[in-house]
């Protein structure tokens, strides 16, 4: 029956068909769907999906969604169909299809599991046994990320005090879009015992830099001259450095921040590769000077901005005087 | 001595097209970045976006994505702001400021006022 | 995205007298971050105060900045005819919306 358009725009259509969902990797939740049965031939099916907590709302022409999620709850997508791209359109019954995450004990699932990408060179998770599970549970960590063409398996299981941990290796590559994208993980025990857990690691936080290393500490007139190599793997914008110097006569402890800086001076070894030097102003040469210096990532570059690396390897300058 | 000199004000109708400019001296322009303020009249500061001339990399606030272009021409340490079609609401004055990792704004220009009146 | 809250928004004092200003994150940040500016009528915004606490060039000892976390406070121990001004807080992309100091 032939419908003028004012009245297939308003009229509500069949529901999608054949909803279903699968899982990717470890972490990628797709949810593919067919056109409903018996719509509007002049209809140009959009189709409205959303979340169960009507979040992540989205009108678009494909037959697919996919959500990249730490499968460690339920979740739920809901999908209707319609005709026009209008969100105020009433879409048809929506259809629901949720995943839920593997069965086992919540109780035994691992805790507070969180990695760091150390210096763009190689990534550290750690975890906590969960409350109901054996003491001598063999943890094993999976991990997968776009430039890796299966999931991998985690070798260098290890254990620091409560915690235990796996490291491997993920360097940074130049695809200037690796950054944007995401390491997804999964922990759970040899013996299928435990219940799995998840987590979703965005490589634009927790990158921890190396500490730097103090090359050369010299004195010029009342200045003291600072130079050190930079970490690798990092471009000079991501960074920032900050220079302590503690003074053993007066007891003072001076911090400064320092953006990476051209060894310019003659004090310095120049143009040597990757290093940054920083003059200090005002110091008694007279007197016992220790330096030590951090490093931490620009927000503009490295979202998490509350890590910094270890700090360096202290190095000292002047005399110690004798306390008369 | 970091000095950043900007351009002059600028009277401009709606739908026209501007770009000021923003030169810095006293340091090595390529290895700090450019932050662009804008200060509508009676208000307050609201960051706009920033410049990295050492490789032109930029980043924009939301709510200024797609409204401005932030550019820099290394080679005479200059970096401009930029409007394809003006509206009465960019009137303003718009600050260039320098800006090292950490995020602060640490000299900023003397500022440009952008008036736009039909 | 975070947003900076100063308050008060007005702080009515007289010279001499000690000034406290509030500025509250809407989430944790990093305090090597925020940075305190000073701003007086018809002129560009002058930077006080970068992490949290460090003094910029040229800054008078008068003025310090401290907290952590959400909460972070510039302190003016004792104000000069100079200071009464309007002072900003600010992270990266955000700035709170200002606090005038003006001359009870």
């Known amino acids: 029956d032939y419908k003028d358009d004012d009245e297939s725009r308003t009229e509500t259509q069949p529901p999608v068909t054949n909803l279903s969902v699968s899982v990717e990797n470890l972490c990628t939740v797709i949810w593919t769907w067919n056109p409903p049965e018996g719509a509007s031939s002049n209809c140009s099916l959009w189709y409205f999906s959303h979340f169960g907590d009507k979040q992540d709302k989205k009108i678009a022409p494909e037959t697919r969604r996919s959500i990249e999620v730490p499968l460690n709850e339920r979740i739920c997508l809901q999908v209707g169909s319609q005709c026009s791209t209008n969100e105020s359109e009433k879409p048809s019954i929506l259809v629901e299809k949720c995943i839920s995450p593997p069965e086992g004990d919540p109780e035994s699932a691992v805790t507070e599991l969180q990695c760091i990408w150390h210096n763009l060179s190689y990534m550290k998770c750690s975890w906590l046994p969960g409350r109901n599970t054996s003491p001598d549970t063999n943890y094993t960590l999976y991990y997968w990320h776009r430039s890796l063409e299966k999931i991998h398996q985690c070798e260098n299981i290890f254990r620091e005090g409560q915690y235990f941990g796996c490291s491997f290796d993920l360097t940074k590559v130049k695809d200037s879009s690796f950054e944007q994208h995401s390491v997804q993980i999964m922990v759970k025990d040899n013996a299928g015992k435990i219940k799995p857990s998840f987590n979703i690691v965005p490589l634009t936080s927790r990158v921890k830099p190396d500490p730097p290393h103090i090359k050369n500490l010299s004195f010029h007139n009342d200045d003291l001259y600072v130079q050190w190599e930079n970490p690798q793997n990092f471009i000079s914008r991501c960074l920032f450095y900050e220079v302590e110097v503690n003074n053993s006569q007066t007891e003072t402890h001076n911090v400064f921040y320092v953006q990476e800086a051209k060894c310019e001076n003659p004090e310095f070894e120049r143009n040597v590769e990757n290093t940054s030097c920083f003059m200090v102003p005002g110091v008694l040469p007279d007197t016992l000077n220790t330096v030590r210096i951090r490093v931490k990532t620009n927000k503009l570059c490295y979202e998490d901005d509350k890590l910094w690396s270890n700090w360096s390897q202290e190095m000292s300058i002047g005399k110690k005087r004798n306390s008369t | 001595e970091v000095q950043l000199v900007q351009s002059g004000a600028e009277v401009k109708k709606p739908g026209e097209s501007l770009k000021i400019s923003c030169k810095g001296s006293?340091?090595?322009?390529?290895?700090?970045?450019i932050g662009w303020v804008r200060q509508m009249p009676g208000k307050g500061l609201e960051w706009m976006g920033v410049i990295y001339p050492g490789d032109s990399y930029t980043r924009y606030s939301p709510s200024f994505q797609g409204q401005v272009t932030i550019s820099a021409d290394k080679s005479i340490s200059t970096a401009y702001l930029q409007w394809s079609s003006l509206k009465a609401s960019d009137t303003a004055m718009y600050y260039c400021?320098?800006?090292?990792?950490?995020?602060?704004?640490?000299?900023w220009g003397q500022g440009t006022l952008v008036t736009v009146s039909s | 995205e975070i947003v900076l809250t100063q308050s008060p928004g007005t702080l009515s004092l007289s010279p001499g007298e000690r000034a406290t200003l509030s500025c509250r994150a809407s989430?944790?940040?990093?305090?090597?971050?925020l940075a305190w500016y000073q701003q007086k009528p018809g002129q560009a915004p002058r930077l006080l105060i970068y992490g949290a606490s460090s003094r910029a060039t040229g800054i008078p000892d008068r003025f310090s900045g401290s907290g952590s976390g959400t909460d972070f406070t510039l302190t003016i121990s004792r104000l000069e005819p100079e200071d009464f001004a309007v002072y900003y807080c600010?992270?990266?992309?955000?700035f709170g919306q200002g606090t005038k100091v003006e001359i009870k």
């Open positions: 400021a320098r800006m090292p990792n950490w995020g602060s704004l640490d000299s």
């Open positions: 006293g340091y090595s322009f390529t290895s700090y970045w």
């Open positions: 989430q944790s940040i990093s305090s090597s971050y």
């Open positions: 600010q992270q990266y992309e955000t």
